[in-house]
Interface confidence: low
């Protein structure tokens, strides 16, 4: 038997483990907490709607919650959606959360609330209090928290959330909670670190606020401090993407030489945007376990050339001295310090944003000795020439990232390498990286309403490139040409992105044959001309292949265009040319004994697969060892007669989504012996097989979402013992019978999707009603999303709640 | 074919020195972290001892129960690596092993993809 | 140091049996945990690393897995020649430290 009500609109899931009952009612557009909530619930998520209060009776009964995040219930007006504003805060009544004796963490963020709620039991370990309107802290209303780990009082007072007040925090307020590790108060427009703090801190995060000035005494006794985020306090405003005020007369945040003295056990220290001009090394002298320090978005060009600083950080892992480059200064080359070479334990540096004309080997000598180091990022530096050579010193190293930049080839076969004759004027050189938010975010840790743990931020790295091995990211950049020598020294490389540039030559096997051990190459988004059969064969362990928005050649009329080019690359795994508008080939057939995998996605098998036209149903037919074909986005409004034959022997899975189909052909599958999963889903299909196992004895996954099927036909799953997923959803469906569904296949549906169709709730589905209501299938959004379209009374009402008594309920046969 | 081989255990009374060798083929020696690992009767494996590779200098590191009685070299021109022990005791008994470190582009992984068939050490009166 | 801990010291199996052989650590070791097959008057053979990935040569029937404290080897389909000591080893943090062994028997 069920442990709770199907009626109940959350997800209900058991983590073993950690003897966890999890309900989570997240984005359920729910107005009052639902009932038929499991009694044992641990952890219980509210998040996203619009509950308008809590009271005692709110979690009444519910005496093992250990967890209640019950954010954005009325996030403050300029945060939160413009067409559901909330305009009544949350009220929080007294005693609502004190009998739950082992509650541990609470969220409440995005609630407008005023003040710190009181009432809170004693075995509370957590709070989170962001994005309200809490913008005076006292004493007083941190009494009860003396337990509490982890507090989070940050977006009460900024740009977003604005309070229009100074932010306030008592003397001492902190003080007396003798268990806090951990406290955020970013983005509040603070104007002091607050003093005296707790000597159990561990994590301390005062990013963006408005203080000018560290004292020496700020950090006295934080003698456990492991992460300090001091970031954007006197931020550096060049090219900010949100409103940006800095330090009076542009200056850098002030830190006392001695500030620093009692981190001892500092990791993680965070200096981004604070217009720093010099780094002492005095603030380091006590923090040789320094593993993460983040400089970007500074003052530091001349500093990176110094850096002496560099000779206390034995420890470091990580170094960011991004976007530190003087406004209105087009370098020659990059200056690195000596001090580099120091940093024995270096694994990631990253200097984007220094902005120099070319890269020479001996700009990068400091490093050459970095035995751990595994990232160096010398993204969006608008470098113009760079031989590639030099990296035959950094075979050790698991990223080049040379992204966005202004490389482009040589005008002959010297040593120069890649080289470039744009135009220099410096208005061109201000870094234009707002599509790829990371150091121009304003909080890049900020938590979105879904997720309680902090966005993480990405950097550009392919990580699927990225895992075979040693890569090289050229992406972005202005290379119209590649030959061989361009790579010459770097056959250790196992991952070469090209994406993005303006590569147009007919490639014959061998512009890219110094790369004998590359594994994945990206050359998406340039100008492929595949005029030679023998183009990327040089590549003999290539793996991986993406050729994809190469449209350019294959839009015009009377190109060869040799699409058996993976004839020759003998280990070929994956291929992906999505969205090349492919409709013309000059080769009827693709060959590979190695390819599982083609992503056709967005090209013109219509106009290949014209109606008449049999030469190109064969198409795919010769990859043999094909099990994923992708021809999705291929405006397939039918399928000839032939396509199925034309298949490949082992394909597993088939997409066939987004095309526009009306029909098809389900008998025809019965060619595919051993199809496992097909994808119809966003098509226009409006009938289902007579009998899917009549069509398919393989088939485990069937998608059909997104279509205009308005019922299903009688037979419709009968036998068909080997369907482990079934999505339905988002059709016109509105009668399923009992025939339709034999019970002895649902029962081995691991997922059944059914959500936004049209069900008739009339007698007729009185079977319907009561299967739903008891079976153990998963049927996700059952109780919200899986409604009734009439008649009548029963208009908008959820499937599981129907009352069908007074129909004559027979459920014999 | 990547081989490890120990010599130089026996029978060594408390208070005695030994010094064991690994002799290595089939790598490049100095590329790697090399390491002992011991193992006493009836008792847990037990990393004793480190020697880095040419990229780290080749420098050392110990486990507390040997830090200042034992001493891990190596002969980068024989492609041998020793460990010699000083100040032995009873509970040093242990069949000890050589192994190689499984090596991440040069970065030390602390775990071992190469073991020698190991070699007996028995400290007794 | 971090101590490795295996609870059970024998498990007994039959071939074709699905077994697991469990390595609790005494701190976090984020994934960095080895596991190593010792037969009988043989020297230790590296099996899994990093909690979940295969040495190169190793049978698909060997499958790590775990996270935090918690750490498994599991072997889908026991064969004769799996009799052995197996430990778990955790490379997270210097020392490299051992679980104490759990010696798998073949009914």
């Known amino acids: 038997a069920r442990w709770f009500p199907k009626t109940l609109p959350c997800d209900v899931t058991l983590d073993v483990p950690k003897n966890h009952v999890i309900v989570d009612c997240t984005d359920k557009h729910l107005t009052e907490i639902p009932g038929g909530i499991p009694t044992n619930t641990t952890n219980l998520t509210l998040t996203i709607n619009h509950i308008p209060d809590i009271s005692p009776a709110s979690f009444h009964r519910l005496d093992h919650l250990v967890e209640i995040d019950f954010r954005c219930n009325c996030v403050p007006i300029p945060l939160g959606s413009k067409n559901n504003m909330c305009i009544k805060r949350l009220q929080i009544k007294p005693r609502s959360f004190s009998g739950l004796t082992y509650l541990k963490s609470l969220y409440l963020d995005g609630n407008q609330l005023l003040e710190i709620p009181q009432g809170l039991p004693p075995s509370l370990q957590l709070l989170s209090l962001e994005a309200n309107n809490i913008f005076s802290i006292r004493k007083e209303n941190l009494t009860e928290l003396a337990n509490i780990e982890i507090l989070y009082l940050g977006q009460n007072c900024y740009y977003r959330n604005p309070c229009y007040v100074s932010y306030s925090i008592e003397k001492d307020a902190f003080l007396n909670l003798t268990k806090l590790k951990v406290l955020s108060l970013k983005d509040n427009n603070v104007t002091a670190v607050p003093t005296v703090l707790p000597s159990t801190l561990t994590e301390l995060y005062l990013y963006n606020n408005m203080i000018a000035k560290i004292q020496e005494d700020d950090f006295n006794n934080l003698n456990q401090l492991q992460i300090l985020d001091l970031s954007g306090n006197c931020p550096r405003c060049y090219n900010a993407p949100f409103p940006c005020a800095p330090c009076k007369n542009n200056s850098p945040l002030q830190i006392h030489d001695n500030a620093f003295n009692s981190l001892t056990e500092l990791k993680v220290l965070r200096l981004h945007s604070n217009s720093l001009q010099h780094v002492p090394p005095t603030w380091f002298k006590n923090m040789n376990k320094l593993q993460e320090l983040d400089l970007s978005q500074n003052f530091l060009a001349k500093e990176i050339g110094d850096a002496k600083f560099l000779h206390f950080l034995p420890s470091l892992i990580q170094l960011d001295l991004s976007f530190n480059f003087e406004l209105q200064v087009y370098r020659a080359s990059m200056n690195l310090s000596q001090a580099f070479s120091s940093l024995k334990s270096l694994k990631i540096l990253r200097i984007r944003g220094y902005v120099f004309k070319e890269l020479k080997s001996f700009n990068l000598s400091p490093l050459h000795n970095l035995q751990n180091l595994e990232v160096l990022d010398l993204g969006t530096n608008f470098i113009k020439i760079a031989n590639l050579s030099m990296f035959k010193q950094f075979k050790r190293l698991k990223v080049i990232d040379l992204s966005v930049n202004k490389i482009s080839p040589s005008g002959d076969s010297s040593e120069v390498g890649f080289c470039s004759n744009a135009r220099t004027s410096v208005e061109s050189y201000e870094p234009q990286v707002l599509e790829q938010l990371h150091y121009f975010r304003y909080d890049k840790y900020a938590r979105s309403c879904r997720f309680k743990n902090k966005e993480a931020s990405f950097m550009s790295v392919n990580e699927s490139c990225y895992k075979y091995g040693q890569t090289l990211d050229l992406s972005k950049n202005s290379i119209f040409f590649v030959k061989s020598s361009d790579f010459q020294h770097l056959s250790f490389l196992k991952c070469l992105n090209l994406s993005g540039n303006l590569i147009s030559q007919t490639l014959n096997g061998s512009e890219f044959q110094p790369l004998a051990e590359l594994r994945y190459l990206d050359f998406s988004n340039n100008r492929l001309d595949l005029l030679h059969s023998t183009a990327f064969e040089e590549l003999h362990k290539l793996e991986v292949l993406d050729i994809s928005s190469n449209s350019h050649y294959f839009q015009s009329e009377g190109i060869t265009h040799m699409l058996n080019f993976t004839k020759n690359l003998k280990v070929l795994q994956k291929l992906m040319m999505n969205d090349n508008d492919i409709s013309s080939s000059t080769s009827r057939t693709m060959e590979s004994e190695s390819l599982r995998t083609l992503e056709f996605r967005g090209n013109h098998l219509d106009v290949l697969w014209r109606e008449g036209d049999n030469r190109y149903l064969q198409l795919f037919k010769n990859l043999l060892k094909l099990e994923e074909l992708d021809i999705s986005k291929n405006s397939l409004s039918f399928l000839p007669s032939g396509v199925f034959d034309g298949m490949p022997p082992n394909l597993k899975n088939l997409s066939l989504a987004k095309n526009g189909l009306k029909s098809f052909s389900w008998k025809k599958l019965q060619c595919l012996k051993n199809l496992e999963t097909l994808d119809l889903s966003h098509n226009q299909l409006t009938t289902v097989p007579e009998r899917l196992s009549n069509c398919s004895r393989s088939l485990k996954n069937l998608i059909l979402k997104n279509n205009q099927i308005r019922s299903l036909t009688k037979y419709f799953l009968q036998d068909a013992f080997q369907l482990r997923y079934l999505d339905l959803s988002s059709n016109k469906i509105q009668m399923i019978q009992k025939t339709s569904f034999p019970e002895n296949v649902l029962n081995n549906l691991k997922m059944l999707l059914l959500h936004h169709n049209r069900f008739l709730c009339t007698c007729d589905a009185v079977w319907f009603v009561w299967w739903v209501n008891h079976t153990e299938v998963t049927i996700p959004y059952l109780a919200t999303d899986v409604t009734c379209v009439g008649p009548g009374a029963h208009k908008g009402q959820s499937v599981i709640s129907l009352d069908l008594y007074t129909c004559e309920l027979d459920l014999t046969n | 074919e990547v081989k490890l081989v120990e010599s130089g255990g026996g029978l060594v009374q408390p208070g005695g020195s030994l010094r064991l060798s690994c002799t290595t083929s089939?790598?490049?020696?100095?590329?790697?972290?090399m390491e002992w690992v011991r193992q006493p009767p009836g008792k847990r494996l037990e990393w004793i001892a480190a020697?880095?590779?040419?990229?780290?200098?080749?420098?050392?590191e110990y486990s507390a129960s040997v830090k200042g009685r034992f001493i891990v070299s190596r002969d980068t021109s024989q492609n041998i690596l020793y460990l010699q022990m000083n100040a032995l005791r009873a509970e040093d008994t242990a069949i000890y092993y050589c192994?190689?470190?499984?090596?991440?582009?040069?970065?030390?992984?602390?775990?071992?993809?190469?073991w020698g068939a190991g070699t007996t050490v028995t400290v007794s009166s | 140091d971090i101590v490795m801990t295996q609870s059970h010291k024998f498990m007994s199996t039959s071939v074709g049996d699905r077994v697991s052989i469990t390595c609790k650590a005494s701190?976090?070791?984020?994934?960095?945990v080895a596991w190593y097959q010792q037969k009988p008057g043989q020297s230790p053979k590296l099996l899994i690393y990093w909690a979940s990935t295969r040495h190169t040569g190793v049978p698909d029937r060997f499958t790590g897995s775990g996270s935090g404290t918690d750490y498994t080897l599991t072997i889908s389909s026991v064969q004769a020649e799996d009799l052995a000591l197996y430990y778990c080893?955790?490379?997270?943090?210097?020392?490299?430290?051992f679980g104490g062994g759990t010696k798998l028997e073949i009914k």
């Open positions: 192994a190689r470190d499984a090596d991440y582009y040069g970065s030390s992984t602390w775990y071992f993809d190469v």
């Open positions: 701190q976090d070791v984020r994934t960095a």
């Open positions: 080893q955790q490379h997270y943090n210097t020392p490299p430290t």
């Open positions: 089939g790598f490049t020696f100095s590329d790697f972290y």
């Open positions: 020697s880095r590779n040419k990229r780290n200098d080749h420098t050392t």
